[in-house]
Interface confidence: low
Amino acid sequence: MMTGTIETTGNISAEKGGSIILQCHLSSTTAQVTQVNWEQQDQLLAICNADLGWHISPSFKDRVAPGPGLGLTLQSLTVNDTGEYFCIYHTYPDGTYTGRIFLEVLESSVAEHGARFQIP
């Protein structure tokens, strides 16, 4: 039975040209995290593999930095970065846990970070 839950940074906003940290945290399970994938819609951004370390997709390597922890830092944000991001925790023996973050990149200089929330 899958007992874990994923906490994420939730719905967040940031300024165009700035940077943002996407973070997820898996709790309430003793399952071993083997790999974490970060995806934007259907595009792979990065992989953090327990054995092999980080891999950043070539098309994002200039704007994506690994960490902190299992999180991901997006830099030089553009309005086109607005959208859904997913952290996909591959664990054993539980299987896959998925967290969702919605990022809005604003032209305005006023960009408030959303509160953390737990996915039901």
């Epitope: 899958m2 874990g4 839950t5 994923i6 790999q35 994938n37 995806e39 819609q41 259907d42 595009q43 792979l44 992989i47 859904e84 997913f86 996909i88 591959h90 539980d94 299987g95 896959t96 846990y97 998925t98 969702r100 996915i119 039901p120």
Partner: nanobody
Framework: EVQLVESGGGLVQPGGSLRLSCAAS????????MGWFRQAPGKEREFVAT????????FYADSVKGRFTISADNSKNTAYLQMNSLKPEDTAVYYC?????????????WGQGTLVTVSS
């Protein structure tokens, strides 16, 4: 709501191959990950493999790594499990499972299962 229907099970000799299919219908846009579990007679259901919506993230149980391959065809809304070098201990009912984007993990939706028997 999402419905999952498995097919492709049957009787195969040790060392043989089978390909299972899991066809998704309904609110398929809400699916984020799909995977396979199995349950042998008298045993608990165990995780086999999983694949993320984009197809770039896959993970396997140690017992099937190198022998089984999970894949997905988004145009057909179908996930596949190619099983090679089958062993008698692979005999089980194989279940397809899926998770929603906002889910905590695989197992939101289950298929009815398809029986795989490996015997000479």
């Amino acid at each position: 709501e999402v419905q999952l229907v498995e097919s492709g099970g049957g009787l195969v000799q040790p060392g043989g191959s089978l390909r299972l299919s899991c066809a998704a219908s309904g609110s398929i846009s809400s699916i984020h990950a799909m995977g396979w579990f199995r349950q042998a007679p008298g045993k608990e259901r165990e995780f086999v493999a999983t694949i993320s919506r984009s197809g770039v993230g896959t993970f396997y149980a140690d017992s099937v790594k190198g022998r089984f391959t999970i894949s997905a065809d988004n145009s057909k809304n179908t996930a596949y499990l190619q099983m090679n070098s089958l062993k008698p201990e692979d005999t089980a009912v194989y279940y397809c499972a899926s998770s929603y984007s906002s889910s905590s993990g695989l197992g939101d939706i289950w298929g009815q299962g398809t029986l795989v028997t490996v015997s000479s």
